[in-house]
């Protein structure tokens, strides 16, 4: 996925990674010996964050618009290495595929497992959260699942806006040239839904819909 | 150690609102479900609402929904409970209390003190 | 919904001695996982219920040993070995199966 290319553009930055950035560095002039406890840093960011009105939060936005207009310029003109024809273009204004139930609930309770046993692996981590999925009476999961629901319908209306607009010209021409079998196609179509939930997991949750579903 | 404290009870009448309000401290807020529990002058208890950690996903019983709003401020470390068009009938004493869920089988572990709703002309 | 019975409604107990309350479910508490979707909680006078027994068996922290929770499906019983003037009070079951539903309550209450 142009991992070790150098030449790939540089993933864009979200306003709350700004902000975060900032903190770094007004920290570093504050402070340029002392040695950063990285989740009591990342605590503090995220309550200063919380408690920044609109027009403060201002600032980071336009930077984060900036680098999204400057990710998008140098990915039209950006051509993976041989090697990587395998995957392909993603537009970054194309719909974001809708997280799952299973996977919203992991996105209340990852931080709990995490904070709970410091030393875990990903893995570890993740196999507490699906015991705990497997462990939640129906009734429990059905707001997840309610939720999931209210996602994806909005996705499918989305994509569907979308894909009657037209793709952008690079995504035509398309980076993969050959004519997938169904079952290859369906199999990146997974690969790539995976990819997204990695994505969303990665991004601060700043602007978390708060939508109350009632059971 | 964990501590839950309720406010905002008091008399109101038949068709008012109270919002309740209940402090959390001594662990990580934002990483619990909550929820409000109440029980009526020498009645037994009953499940009121419940809220997830992000506050995202709220959940009531049909005795409330439409009228009771259950919502979270984690970086104050607050649960709430707007109550609209009370009844006579919601008059009790309201707890909040945290759910620990023990991979995923959930119980209210802690407790608050409690504070008393009375909907009265 | 899950209705939730509790017997009998007031129990007259000697300090010392055995006592026991029952809950049935209108319907099983049983989980696919094989644990039971029950807690009990103890609520003295004067004061905020607090956690007993969750899971149908498991003591809460700090618990004393002469409590012990028993059962499965859709009857528990909640067992004192002897009881101590300090359990006195109102006890609920609980079930989190559906939604969250309690028992009316026994009162214990010393003899």
């Known amino acids: 996925m142009g991992k070790g290319d150098p030449k790939k553009p540089r993933g864009k930055m979200s306003s709350y990674a700004f902000f975060v950035q900032t903190c770094r560095e007004e920290h570093k002039k504050k402070h340029p010996d002392a040695s950063v406890n990285f989740s009591e840093f990342s605590k503090k960011c995220s309550e200063r964050w919380k408690t920044m009105s609109a027009k403060e939060k201002g600032k980071f936005e336009d930077m984060a618009k900036a680098d999204k207009a400057r990710y998008e310029r140098e990915m039209k003109t950006y051509i993976p290495p041989k090697g990587e024809t395998k995957k392909k273009f993603k537009d970054p204004n194309a719909p974001k595929r809708p997280p799952s139930a299973f996977f919203l609930f992991c996105s209340e309770y990852r931080p709990k497992i995490k904070g709970e046993h410091p030393g875990l692996s990903i893995g570890d981590v993740a196999k507490k959260l699906g015991e705990m999925w497997n462990n939640t009476a129906a009734d429990d999961k059905q707001p997840y699942e309610k939720k999931a629901a209210k996602l994806k319908e909005k996705y499918e209306k989305d994509i569907a806006a979308y894909r009657a607009k037209g793709k952008p010209d690079a995504a035509k021409k398309g980076v993969v040239k050959a004519e997938k079998s169904k079952k290859k196609k369906e199999e990146e179509e997974d690969e790539e839904d995976e990819e997204d939930e990695e994505e969303e997991e990665d991004e601060e949750d700043e602007d978390e819909e708060e939508d109350d579903d009632d059971e | 150690e964990v501590q839950l404290l309720e406010s905002g009870g008091g008399l109101v009448q038949p068709g008012g609102s109270l919002r309740l309000s209940c402090a959390a401290s001594?662990?990580?807020?934002?990483?619990?479900?909550m929820v409000w529990v109440r029980q009526a002058p020498g009645k037994g208890l009953e499940w009121v609402s419940s809220?997830?950690?992000?506050?995202?996903?709220?959940i009531y019983a049909d005795s409330v929904k439409g009228r009771f709003t259950i919502s979270r401020d984690n970086s104050k470390n607050t649960l709430y409970l707007q109550m609209n068009s009370l009844r006579a009938e919601d008059t009790a004493v309201y707890y909040c209390?945290?759910?620990?869920?023990?991979?995923?089988?959930?119980?209210?572990?802690?407790w608050g003190q409690g504070t008393l709703v009375t909907v009265s002309s | 919904d899950i209705q939730m019975t509790q017997s009998p409604l007031s129990l007259p107990v000697t300090p010392g001695e055995p006592a026991s309350i029952s809950c049935r479910s209108s319907?099983?508490?049983?989980?696919?996982?094989?644990?039971?979707?029950l807690d009990w909680y103890l609520q003295r006078p004067g004061q905020s219920p607090q956690l007993l027994i969750y899971?149908?068996?498991n003591r809460a922290s700090g618990v004393p040993d002469r409590f012990s929770g028993s059962g499965s499906g859709t009857d528990f019983t909640l067992k004192i070995s002897r009881v101590e003037a300090e359990d006195v009070g109102v006890y609920y079951c609980?079930?989190?199966?559906?939604?969250?539903?309690f028992g009316q309550g026994t009162k214990v209450e010393i003899k």
């Open positions: 809220i997830v950690p992000s506050g995202g996903i709220t």
């Open positions: 001594g662990f990580t807020f934002s990483w619990y479900k």
């Open positions: 319907q099983s508490l049983l989980h696919g996982n094989g644990y039971n979707y």
């Open positions: 209390a945290r759910v620990q869920q023990w991979l995923g089988r959930p119980y209210f572990d802690y």
């Open positions: 609980m079930q989190s199966l559906q939604s969250r539903t």
């Open positions: 899971s149908g068996s």
